[in-house]
Every structure is written in structure tokens, then in C-alpha cells.
């Protein structure tokens, strides 16, 4: 807290300019009018105030706007945004995507801070859904943004927004998140032809059910092993050896290197050894010839 003292003669600020960087904190408090500061916020970012001086400027704005800053001020906060607490930000009503971009720019290159997370939350809640432009903006600044949302939050993403998602945006998503995103992606890309569709849907396949994988196996997609390894184990298990061979195409040889890892390991255990042998990869661990496989889960369902 800066002590209240009278402004020295001749030091009253008539505009926000570079001369103010030479003011001590108490001089800024005494000589800068809060209303002047609010109308000339766009200048603050270009002036190299120290963080301590920015504290004083924030204090002046807080006194002027105790209920929260108007968007005209928020849009021009610049470095002053770094001084805001999540509590401050919760008082704001940010509706413009330009404002959001301006503030994200200040934090660019850093991890998502609690302030940024609160800002995004306020913005998205204000819009009611995560529309394409917003998602585009957020994933441009924070590629992992989508995967930081809960499955419940992801359910508000309209399928049209999926076009904004890049493969790297899904890198840290877990299966529960992909379960929500996959049906949206399927809907978004449904009018594309086979090979183009596969390119777009590939990153989302960690949420695909068995029937969709079976359908893909009929389309000569040549799925790479990295994508195959991210598929849901429960979706892969019912696939036949022939279906997996068609799904992977020339990449089928990669199964040997992954035979000890899920989902390949679990899938091998469910296949007849005879069928596995047809691949000529030396995969071991299948069901020996002559053994009968009882699907107990099916039996339980019938009883």
C-alpha cells in the first residue's frame, strides 16, 4: 500500500507517457489520475514500468472500478494483466475475442497460469459454448488446452469446432476425453471421402468403438502403429487377425515390436495361434489349436 501524499508541484500527470517511469511509487499514486489512466490504458504496455510501479497503477484502477474493470480497460491491460489475481478476473465480463487474444498474448510462451485459466473460464462461460473461433485461438496459444478440459466440459464443444483441432492439440488427452471428442469428430468429418476422412479422424481414434475400426479396415487406410497403440483396448480386442492386417496394411510388421505392450499384447491373447501365424511375424501367445474359447461375459449377459 502506497502512502497518500500530495503530488509535488509540476508533477501532475497530464498524460500517460514515458516520463512516468521516473516517478517513485508514491508519486505515481499522488500524481496520476485514475480516470486518465483508464482512458489511456493502451499506452501503458509500451512504457517500461517496473512491476512495482504496475502494482500502483493496478491499485488506482481497483479504486476506480471496485466492481470489476470495463472491457475497454481490460482489452488494453497488457503487462498489467500479469498483476491480476483470479479473484480480480472473476469480476470481469469479457465478451470480445480480441480482448481474449490481447491478454493471452501477454502470457505467451509461459504455461497456463491460474489467471489465464480463470480468464478463459469466464470467457467460455459467457459465450455458452466453446465455438470454433475461440477454440482456434485457445489451441493456438495453448496446444494442450483441449486436453485440460473435463469430459463434461468437452461435451459443450460443438462438432463444427472440431475443424480447429490439430493433432498436437490432442497429444495429452486421455481415453475418457477422446471418448467425448471422437463422436463429434466423426460427425464433423462425415462428408469427407475415405482417405481425407482418415487423415482428419486419425488423431481422434483413441475414442473409436470396434465397429468403426472394423469399417476402417475395409478402406485400405494403412494406420500407423503409433495410432494403433493409442486405440481403446476394448475396441481392439474383438478385431480379427484379418481385420487388423487390413487396418494396418504395410505397418502390420510393427506388431512384433509391440507384442508385449497394450493393446497388442491383450489382442494377441484373444487370437487363435493359427491365425496369428498367417501374419508370418512370429507372434506368440495366441490360443493354441483345439482349444475352445468361452466368452463368459456373453454367458453372463444371457443368464
Amino acid at each position: 500500500e502506497v502512502e497518500k501524499t500530495a503530488c509535488p508541484s509540476g508533477k501532475k500527470a497530464r498524460e500517460i507517457d514515458e516520463s512516468l517511469i521516473f516517478y517513485k511509487k508514491w508519486e505515481l499514486e499522488a500524481c496520476v489520475d485514475a480516470a486518465l489512466l483508464a482512458t489511456q490504458m493502451d499506452r501503458v504496455n509500451a512504457i517500461p514500468f517496473t512491476y512495482e510501479q504496475l502494482d500502483v497503477l493496478k491499485h488506482k484502477l481497483d479504486e476506480l472500478y471496485p466492481q470489476g474493470y470495463p472491457e475497454s480497460v481490460i482489452q488494453h491491460l497488457g503487462y498489467l494483466f500479469l498483476k491480476m489475481s483470479p479473484e480480480d478476473i472473476r469480476k470481469w465480463n469479457v465478451t470480445s475475442l480480441e480482448t481474449l487474444k490481447a491478454l493471452l498474448e501477454v502470457n505467451k510462451g509461459h504455461e497456463m497460469s491460474p489467471q489465464v485459466a480463470t480468464l478463459i473460464d469466464r470467457f467460455v462461460k459467457g459465450r455458452g459454448q466453446l465455438d470454433k473461433d475461440t477454440l482456434d485461438t485457445l489451441t493456438a496459444f495453448y496446444p494442450g488446452y483441449l486436453c485440460s478440459l473435463s469430459p463434461e466440459e468437452l461435451s459443450s464443444v460443438p462438432p463444427s469446432s472440431i475443424w480447429a483441432v490439430r493433432p498436437q492439440d490432442l497429444d495429452t488427452c486421455d481415453p475418457r476425453q477422446l471418448d467425448v471428442l471422437y463422436p463429434k469428430a466423426r460427425l464433423a468429418f462425415q462428408n469427407m471421402n475415405g482417405s481425407e476422412y482418415f487423415v482428419k479422424i486419425q488423431s481422434f481414434l483413441g475414442g473409436a468403438p470396434t465397429e468403426d475400426l472394423k469399417a476402417l479396415s475395409q478402406q485400405n487406410v494403412s494406420m500407423d502403429l503409433a495410432t494403433f497403440m493409442k486405440l481403446r483396448t476394448d475396441a481392439v480386442l474383438p478385431l480379427t487377425v484379418a481385420e487388423v492386417q487390413k487396418l494396418l496394411g504395410p505397418h502390420v510388421e510393427g506388431l512384433k515390436a509391440e507384442e508385449r505392450h497394450r493393446p497388442v499384447r491383450d489382442w494377441i491373447l484373444r487370437q487363435r495361434q493359427d491365425d496369428l501365424d498367417t501374419l508370418g511375424l512370429g507372434l506368440q501367445g495366441g490360443i493354441p489349436n483345439g482349444y475352445l474359447v468361452l466368452d463368459l461375459s456373453m454367458q453372463e449377459a444371457l443368464s
Epitope: 517511469i21 517500461p48 514500468f49 517496473t50 512491476y51 512495482e52 510501479q53 504496475l54 503487462y79
Partner: nanobody, 115 residues
Framework: EVQLVESGGRSVQAGETLRLSCTAS????????MGWYRQAPGDECELVST???????NYADSVKGRFTISQDNAKNTVYLQMTSLKPEDTAIYSC?????????WGQGTLVTVSS
């Protein structure tokens, strides 16, 4: 990693002259606006002088006409020439890139002016 090392501070009598140096490394010196800050015991940090990448300079009212800031890009060094020193100039002097927005922080170099 940005490094700034200040030197040249010592005890002098009022009216004497002193030159402080600040040698920089870890960033593009010629493109940076630099500043000298000072903090007197029990007082708050204040900016004394700045020099921009184009060579233009600015000074706090309290040192105008007495202090001169300059830089040598070849040596990655910024200087503060202080003349007609007064007891109220006693402080720890630090140099900073203006973009860092940090002000008084770190070691600095101590200037003591006695009357």
C-alpha cells in the same frame, strides 16, 4: 541467461565524480533499452537514467545536468558518469534492461557520498 554485473561504486566526498559500469551478457545488447536504478537505505527504488537502443537518453529530475548515461556496444557495457555528487545520491545502483521491468534487485554497486 541474462547477466548484468555492476562495478565502480565506492565512498567519495560531496562534489566528487564517479563512473559506474555495467557489463552485460546473455542477450542482444545493441537492441536493448537499458536503465540505471538506485535505492537509498530506507527509501524506495527509483529510476535514475535510461538509454535506448538508438542512443537517446533520459534522466530523473534529481540528477539532470549532473549524471550522464552512455554505452559501448562493442564492450556490451553501459556507463553512468556521476558528477557533483551529493549525500542524497548515496544508494545501491543497479543496471537493468528496461524490458525486464524488475528495477532494484540483485547485487548492484554501493555509492556512499559523505559531506
Amino acid at each position: 541467461e541474462v547477466q548484468l554485473v555492476e562495478s565502480g561504486g565506492r565512498s567519495v566526498q560531496a562534489g566528487e565524480t564517479l563512473r559506474l559500469s555495467c557489463t552485460a551478457s546473455g542477450f542482444t545488447f545493441d537492441d536493448s533499452d537499458m536503465g540505471w536504478y538506485r535505492q537509498a537505505p530506507g527509501d524506495e527504488c527509483e529510476l535514475v537514467s535510461t538509454i535506448s537502443s538508438d542512443g537517446s537518453t533520459n534522466y530523473a529530475d534529481s540528477v539532470k545536468g549532473r549524471f550522464t548515461i552512455s554505452q559501448d556496444n562493442a564492450k556490451n557495457t553501459v556507463y553512468l558518469q556521476m558528477t557533483s555528487l551529493k549525500p542524497e545520491d548515496t544508494a545501491i545502483y543497479s543496471c537493468r534492461t528496461m524490458a525486464s521491468r524488475i528495477g532494484c534487485w540483485g547485487q548492484g554497486t554501493l555509492v556512499t557520498v559523505s559531506s
